[in-house]
Amino acid sequence: MSITGISPITEYLASLSTYNDQSITFALEDESYEIYVEDLKKDEKKDKVLLSYYESQHPSNESGDGVDGKMLMVTLSPTKDFWLHANNKEHSVELHKSEKPLPDQAFFVLHNMHSNSVSFESKTDPGVFIGVKDNHLALIKVDSSENLSTENILFKLSETHHHHHH
């Protein structure tokens, strides 16, 4: 799968929550960032993530929400110079400081699911999705397309701002 173009086609600043309305939050600790899944009260500030959308070419036999051999991939950045990365070896989702061009581990295929929810499939390990495990984000293997609606890999985006890159 190759990404067409170096610049994102669009960007959204959104808060990320799980299917059952827990918030994905980020905390700086000892010069590294931790990712949490928390129950927040309505008046507690939700953390924001910048989602950068890229168009990618992919072989016709691959699944995804693309049309005409194109599909959407995203990178997720909660703070400047830090992006979510898939650590396929450890089955973990981590925040790492990176410079552009970003490594493939920072890209996720975006699947639009039912009820305004989305899921994020690892670019480097197809069939593996960002999911929730024990109040943390983890990489979760999904065996078949029927299991794509499993709740622990579904997320909701609450859009707060919309950037267009010209």
């Epitope: 905390a27 928390e38 129950d39 009260k41 507690e44």
Partner: antibody
């Protein structure tokens, strides 16, 4: 489920010291400020100490400043209140409470069950 | 410090009755007000925050309203478990301060 369990209350003589503890579970302790609140028997509630989520800053009213010290151990999900130079007017039930998340939201969403401190000779 | 004055201090009431507790602040607190219930065994529970937002799991018979310096807590139809002490708290300005409490008791 969020739980706060207070302990360490006892009967002590005036001028002595006592340390209270509060063990937290069911939430990410290090993301929240924490607070101690007390209630003199038959009276209202009084805020007595707060600590930021990292433990870097602490706040007290004049009534306990210089005598009481709030601290926390984020690795153990535990809040402490060190009380020195105790006076009879410190006799109260002491509650720990979860305060605001970093600096957003509203305070004291969850409370411990309280622990009774009696200062008497 | 901001002073909070609750009234009445005691509120005798009957099951099924609608009751309202008032909390007046010495200066404007911009809706930064919570309401707490304390049971006879000492257990404290937050009912409402941000003046009118009900905590999840709190029955809808409880409601909060107000602005500026005048706030209130209402219980639309009293149930037996509602006989307790109620406190307001302002968190607009440090130090956070509580009202002196209102005891809702059986008439």
């Amino acid at each position: 489920e969020v739980q706060l369990v207070d302990s360490g209350g006892d009967q002590v003589q005036p001028g002595r010291s006592l340390k209270l503890s509060c063990v937290a579970s069911g939430f990410i302790f290090k993301n929240y400020w924490m607070t101690w609140i007390r209630q003199v028997p038959g009276k209202g509630l009084e805020w007595i100490a707060s600590i930021t989520n990292s433990g870097g800053n602490t706040y007290y009213p004049d009534s306990v400043k210089g005598r009481f010290t709030i601290s926390r151990d984020n690795a153990k999900d535990t809040l402490y209140l060190q009380m020195n130079s105790l006076r009879s007017e410190d006799t109260a039930t002491y509650y720990c409470a979860r305060d605001r998340r970093y600096n957003s939201g509203s305070p004291f969403a969850y409370w411990g069950q309280g622990t009774l401190v009696t200062v008497s000779s | 410090d901001i002073q909070l004055t609750q009234s009445p201090s005691t509120l005798p009431a009957s099951l099924g009755e609608r009751v309202t507790i008032s909390c007046r602040t010495s200066q404007s607190i911009n809706n930064n007000l919570c309401w707490y219930q304390q049971k006879p065994d000492g257990t404290v529970k937050r009912l409402i925050y941000s003046t009118s937002t009900l905590e999840s799991g709190v029955p809808s018979r409880f409601s909060g309203s107000g602005s500026g310096t005048d706030y209130s807590l209402s219980i639309s139809s009293l149930e037996s478990q509602d006989f307790a002490m109620y406190y307001c708290l302002q968190y607009a300005t440090y130090p956070w301060t509580f009202g002196q409490g209102t005891k809702v008791e059986i008439k």
